[in-house]
Interface confidence: medium
């Protein structure tokens, strides 16, 4: 099942995705799609980027991490209730089925209207499992109680590859090196 | 010595099904990524279905998507290809393959040949 | 998905010359962070299934002669056999396992003239 993170209209969408490069610039190619991850590449791409830079994007969608060390995570500025659905980050490991692949749901929910000014205290206590985080423009929104879910399931599907599958010599040999623990 | 040995090969009618094994032995299945490959008479050689290490990944080449399920026992140390709604042009020699860390194909089963006709 | 293509598809060669077999991909299978080229080559005798000669375009697997030798880089590969034994007949392939799905060349046909 996947990972469910929430915004609202207007706001930017944050959909995390991470990995550890075996040293500074070993990048590892990543794409991010529509739609859940398909059996190769991802469908409806957005965003992709290659061992050296971002080399695909499309307008609203963007990386606000440094993806020079791992953080691959998904920007998606001033979300629309059709950016709801789920999203494909793949990391694109060179080998046979070698890549790590993670579905997200983003959820997107009706901006709320208010007859007045909102004074920040009320608009913590409207949403109290809302957490804003640094970006530019409107204020970039998650589920905090969705936070540890994507590392958790990210930890054990990656414990449970390198460890049954072998993947460690692998991960080593293409040069990425997903740390765990 | 890592062997594998196929079965389950054999004529069957278009819309039929057929379930193709591989027992390994010299090594555990699941220590491994798998693959099956095949190859039509006097044709090359096309990758069809894949299963990464874990077991947690299945991978499919888009001529069969839908139609074919890779599994293993790991009880049992073997390797499976379920194939339903066959279809004549999924005639050929099936290969199970074993996969070498992320990389190429090491080690090949003798081959088992599916024919599918009315 | 990569496309590999070999050329020729079939060729004559007599016993003891030098045989070569050429790979082309699609896309480049050189994965910059390691260096190594995610590319090998099998051998398919009549009735047999391949038999791996070749990895990472150039090392050879144990036990195979060593007459045969691999060499290229990025998309550009050649299969090299230096002196072309009566047992080298056989169809032979080049793979990639860069990126999925795994593709091989059509394969070509190696015989003695």
């Known amino acids: 099942s996947e990972v469910e993170y929430r915004a609202e209209v207007g706001q930017n969408a944050y959909l995390p995705c991470f990995y550890t490069p075996a040293a500074p610039g070993n990048l590892v190619p990543v794409c991010w799609g529509k739609g859940a991850c398909p059996v190769f590449e991802c469908g409806n791409v957005v965003l992709r980027t290659d061992e050296r830079d971002v080399n695909y994007w499309t307008s609203r969608y963007w990386l606000n991490g440094d993806f020079r060390k791992g953080d691959v995570s998904l920007t998606i500025e001033n979300v629309t209730l059709a950016d709801s659905g789920i999203y494909c980050c793949r990391i694109q490991i060179p080998g046979i089925m070698n890549d790590e692949k993670f579905n997200l749901k983003l959820v997107i929910k009706p901006a709320k209207v208010t007859p007045a000014p909102t004074r920040q205290r009320d608009f913590t206590a409207a949403f109290p499992r809302m957490l804003t985080t640094r970006g530019h423009g409107p204020a970039e929104t998650q589920t905090l109680g969705s936070l540890p879910d994507i590392n958790l399931t990210q930890i054990s599907t990656l414990a449970n590859e390198l460890r049954d599958s072998r993947l460690a010599n692998d991960l080593r040999d293409s040069g990425a090196t997903i740390r765990i623990g | 010595q890592m062997q594998l040995q196929q079965s389950g090969g054999g004529l069957v009618q278009p819309g039929g099904s057929l379930r193709l094994s591989c027992a390994a032995s010299g090594f555990t299945v699941s220590s491994y990524a798998m693959s099956w490959v095949r190859q039509a008479l006097g044709k090359g050689l096309e990758w069809v279905s894949g299963?990464?290490?874990?077991?947690?990944?299945?991978y499919y080449a888009d001529s069969v998507k839908g139609r074919f399920t890779i599994s293993r026992d790991n009880s049992k140390n073997t390797l499976y290809l379920q194939m339903n709604s066959l279809r004549a042009e999924d005639t050929a020699v099936y290969y199970c393959?074993?996969?070498?860390?992320?990389?190429?194909?090491?080690?090949w089963g003798q081959g088992t040949l599916v024919t599918v006709s009315s | 998905e990569i496309v590999m293509t070999q050329s020729p598809d079939s060729l004559a060669v007599s016993l003891g010359e030098r045989a070569t077999i050429n790979c082309k991909s699609s896309?480049?299978?050189?994965?910059?962070?390691?260096?190594?080229?995610?590319l090998a080559w099998y051998q398919q005798k009549p009735g047999q299934p391949p038999k791996l000669l070749i990895y990472?375009?150039?090392t050879r697997e144990s036990g195979v002669p060593d007459r045969f030798s691999g060499s290229g880089s990025g998309t550009d590969f050649t299969l090299t056999i230096s002196s072309l034994q009566a047992e080298d007949v056989a169809v032979y392939y080049c793979?990639?396992?860069?990126?999925?799905?795994?593709?091989f060349g059509q394969g070509t046909r190696l015989e003695i003239k």
């Open positions: 393959a074993k996969i070498v860390g992320a990389t190429h194909f090491d080690y």
């Open positions: 990472w375009a150039s």
């Open positions: 793979q990639q396992y860069y990126s999925g799905p795994i593709t």
């Open positions: 299963i990464s290490g874990s077991g947690g990944s299945t």
């Open positions: 896309q480049s299978v050189l994965y910059s962070s390691n260096n190594k080229n995610y």
